[in-house]
């Protein structure tokens, strides 16, 4: 079986998936569902997954949820929250995805793949 995916490749694939989501918005993403905003800092992959995993019935982000789980070292389930969430701020999934995409672009440019 193939070896582990290099971090740079995994991050690139995640960015490409977020690009696809951003590009293919014909109607409000996930019917305009709201999710908790997160601090885009260390541990953000788990925080992002914790936030998005609470969105159900939205096929557009299912692949993103799976990909984020590959970046998060622990199992994440719905209703689970870390200190990285800005618990007083909810934003639309579309805005969440855009913010995450732009932050990951910065990380990729800076060579911060983990």
């Amino acid at each position: 079986s193939p070896g582990p995916v290099p971090p740079s490749t995994a991050l690139r694939e995640l960015i490409e998936e977020l690009v696809n989501i951003t590009q293919n918005q014909k109607a409000p993403l996930c019917n305009g569902s709201m999710v908790w905003s997160i601090n885009l800092t260390a541990g953000m992959y788990c925080a992002a997954l914790e936030s998005l995993i609470n969105v159900s019935g939205c096929s557009a982000i299912e692949k993103t949820q799976r990909m984020l789980s590959g970046f998060c070292p622990h199992k994440v389930s719905a209703g689970q929250f870390s200190s990285l969430h800005v618990r007083d701020t909810k934003i639309e999934v579309a805005q969440f995805v855009k913010d995450l995409l732009l932050h990951l672009k910065k990380l990729f440019r800076e060579g911060r793949f983990n």
């Epitope: 690139r12 960015i15 490409e16 690009v19 951003t22 590009q23 293919n24 918005q25 014909k26 579309a94 805005q95 855009k98 995409l101 732009l102 672009k105 990729f108 440019r109």
Partner: antibody, heavy 122, light 108 residues
Amino acid sequence: EVQLLESGGGLVQPGGSLRLSCAASGFTFSSYAMSWVRQAPGKGLEWVSAISGSGGSTYYADSVKGRFTISRDNSKNTLYLQMNSLRAEDTAVYYCAKADFWSGTLWGFDYWGQGTLVTVSS
Amino acid sequence: SYVLTQPPSVSVAPGQTARITCGGNNIGNKIVHWYQQKPGQAPVLVVYDDSDRPSGIPERFSGSNSGNTATLTISRVEAGDEADYYCQVWDSSSDHVVFGGGTKLTVL
């Protein structure tokens, strides 16, 4: 230092053809999407065409689709624009621009050439 | 196709703040870039990804984007800031790059 140098502009009659080139240096050419943007005299910027880093995906403005063809030779670090069936309204300065990320669609253009003037007139 | 609307001109006194708007339907969901173009010169990227500044661009240049309006803000305007400014997005519904019509900034 990133450099983009356009060439191939000039005077051409309506219905004629022209091929623009953009020689790139100072960056890993194949890793970035590239684009052509034009500016008619005294007018604003108008996007013409774009191409992915591999050359596998191409995009065109409606005004040039079917007449212009964008391509690239990554072994020569060169971007091309083949312009056929030229019209008077194609008269403009044509800029070559580098996308600031490998996926050229959502990103901006961080480096531009100085442009080459194309004049379509009889 | 997607349309970006900019005011044709904005005037401001030196030292004041200039705000150049770029209107578009739900532009807040898109990623906006801004270019400065001086007469006879190629455009220069001054703000990318809504609000980031390329290296070498003064901190006086900043951007924001939400709702139906993106804004380029130039604080402490200098005479050298006089130029045309263009906003730009990618329109995924048409697979086109879209530029605004441009705004001429005049420093009084």
